[in-house]
Interface confidence: low
């Protein structure tokens, strides 16, 4: 049986993956539950397992096709549902209209390289994974280095406000161990999010020269 | 067998308002979007707005602000409310619906209810 | 807005003629739907996702096209074929509908 308020909330990552998280303040007893999606305007539904990642909530990931397949376009409405399952029926637990291009969490991005480290600047590129052509040129980027004795969110954020997959950071000390983190957004959709954070690139600068004033 | 009936047509002032009902039977509104379209005499078709079964709602922004679609469940019955009506809404209004996927088109559609907006 | 613009407005053919109509989006669309409405009636489903005939429509009807411009076409003019006929787009909102070609018999 479930009792209390719950909460829907679901992304779309631009191609193939609409992730969605459900919270439940009643108790949720033994019961299978998953989500269902019904584009209004496919020959396709798609169904997963909701899997705990906490006492009161639940998370799992719509495959809709290949990783970098379009499955989704500006103007599909996918109807979500949590469907739970009591006896031998299923109970509609939440339903929400979704527009996927209103909803925009892309994938974290990937292949972070240092292209050139000096020692005060490194230069480092990085690529976004599996990001809608319909994007054009129309993202952002957060990024973020993490310096010796602090922590990630002690690190000023660097704002990118336009599609540049490349960062140079200056003011570096030499011979000094980063770490550093990169995430995207897309300028489109009311409710969109950023992307988690990309893996952090570890780089060391190079030390200054002997017999240099640095 | 899928059927729509618009009712709630008929003369009103300018600046006047009006609820428009469509009545659905074969089908149930909560498992698919239904449209509202409108055809001024002897002129083309105008889309509305759509109310989608989860129950949120798109608009032409020619409406947004006059215009509310709205359903009742327990009714299986969609509505449209108009305000501040001019002679130019004058129309027949229709209420639409996809076949099972909005790919299909507008494979359904009511008989319409005439709106005259005149003093 | 995407404005679909027919051409012809009207036109004139006699029965067993070729009859096409023609559609064309002011920017480009992925979906598009033709519809035959007669007098004092709803409008009727022909054809759907471009060329896909609708259920009982006689398949002398056809659509094809893609982009911007799209085609409509009776291939034999039947004398119940006498209606107006609409485009309209599904590709983004607002929907929109051309402004309708009328088609008559000679």
């Known amino acids: 049986a479930v009792n209390g308020t719950s909460q829907f909330t679901c992304f779309y990552n631009s191609r193939a993956n609409i992730s969605c998280v459900w919270s439940q303040d009643g108790a949720l007893q033994d019961t299978s539950c998953q989500v269902h999606a019904w584009p209004d305007r496919r020959r396709w539904n798609q169904t997963c397992e909701l899997l705990p990642v906490s006492q009161a909530s639940w998370a799992c990931n719509l495959i809709l096709g290949a990783p970098d397949s379009q499955k989704l376009t500006t103007v599909d409405i996918v109807t979500l549902r949590v469907l739970c399952r009591e006896g031998v029926r299923w109970r509609v637990m939440a339903i929400q209209d979704f527009k996927p291009f209103e909803n925009l969490r892309l994938m974290a991005p990937i292949s972070l390289q240092v292209v050139h480290v000096e020692t005060h600047r490194c230069n480092i590129s990085w690529e976004i994974s599996q990001a809608s052509h319909y994007f054009e040129r129309h993202l952002e980027f957060e990024a973020r280095t993490l310096s010796p004795g602090h922590t990630w969110e002690e690190a000023p954020l660097l704002t990118l406000k336009q599609k540049q997959e490349w960062i140079c950071l200056e003011t570096l000390t030499p011979d000094t161990q980063y770490e550093f983190q990169v995430r995207v957004k897309p300028l489109q959709g009311e409710f969109t999010t950023w992307s988690p954070w990309s893996q952090p690139l570890a780089f060391r600068t190079k030390p200054a020269a002997l017999g240099k004033d640095t | 067998e899928v059927q729509l009936l618009e009712s709630g047509g008929g003369l009103v002032q300018p600046g006047g308002s009006l609820r428009l009902s469509c009545a659905a039977s074969g089908f149930t509104v909560t498992s698919y979007g239904v449209h509202w379209v409108r055809q001024a005499p002897g002129k083309g078709l105008e889309w509305v707005g759509v109310?989608?079964?989860?129950?949120?709602?798109d608009y032409n922004a020619a409406f947004i602000s006059r215009f509310t679609i709205s359903r009742d469940n327990s009714k299986n019955t969609l509505y449209l409310q108009m305000n501040s009506l001019q002679a130019e809404d004058t129309a027949i209004y229709y209420c639409?619906?996809?076949?099972?996927?909005?790919?299909?088109?507008?494979?359904?559609w009511g008989q319409g209810t005439l709106v005259t907006v005149s003093s | 807005d995407i404005q679909m613009t027919q051409s012809p407005s009207s036109l004139s053919a006699s029965v067993g003629d070729r009859v096409t109509i023609t559609c064309s989006g002011s920017?480009?669309?992925?979906?598009m739907y033709w519809y035959q409405q007669k007098p004092g009636k709803a409008p009727k489903l022909l054809i759907y996702d471009t060329s896909n005939l609708a259920s009982g429509v006689p398949s002398r009807f056809s659509g094809s096209g893609s982009g911007t411009d799209y085609t409509f076409t009776i291939s034999s003019l039947q004398p119940e074929d006498i209606a107006t006929y609409y485009c309209q787009q599904w590709s983004t909102y607002p929907l929109t509908f051309g402004q309708g070609t009328k088609v008559e018999v000679k």
């Open positions: 639409a619906r996809a076949g099972d996927y909005n790919y299909d088109g507008f494979a359904y």
């Open positions: 920017s480009s669309v992925s979906f």
């Open positions: 109310i989608w079964s989860g129950g949120s709602t």
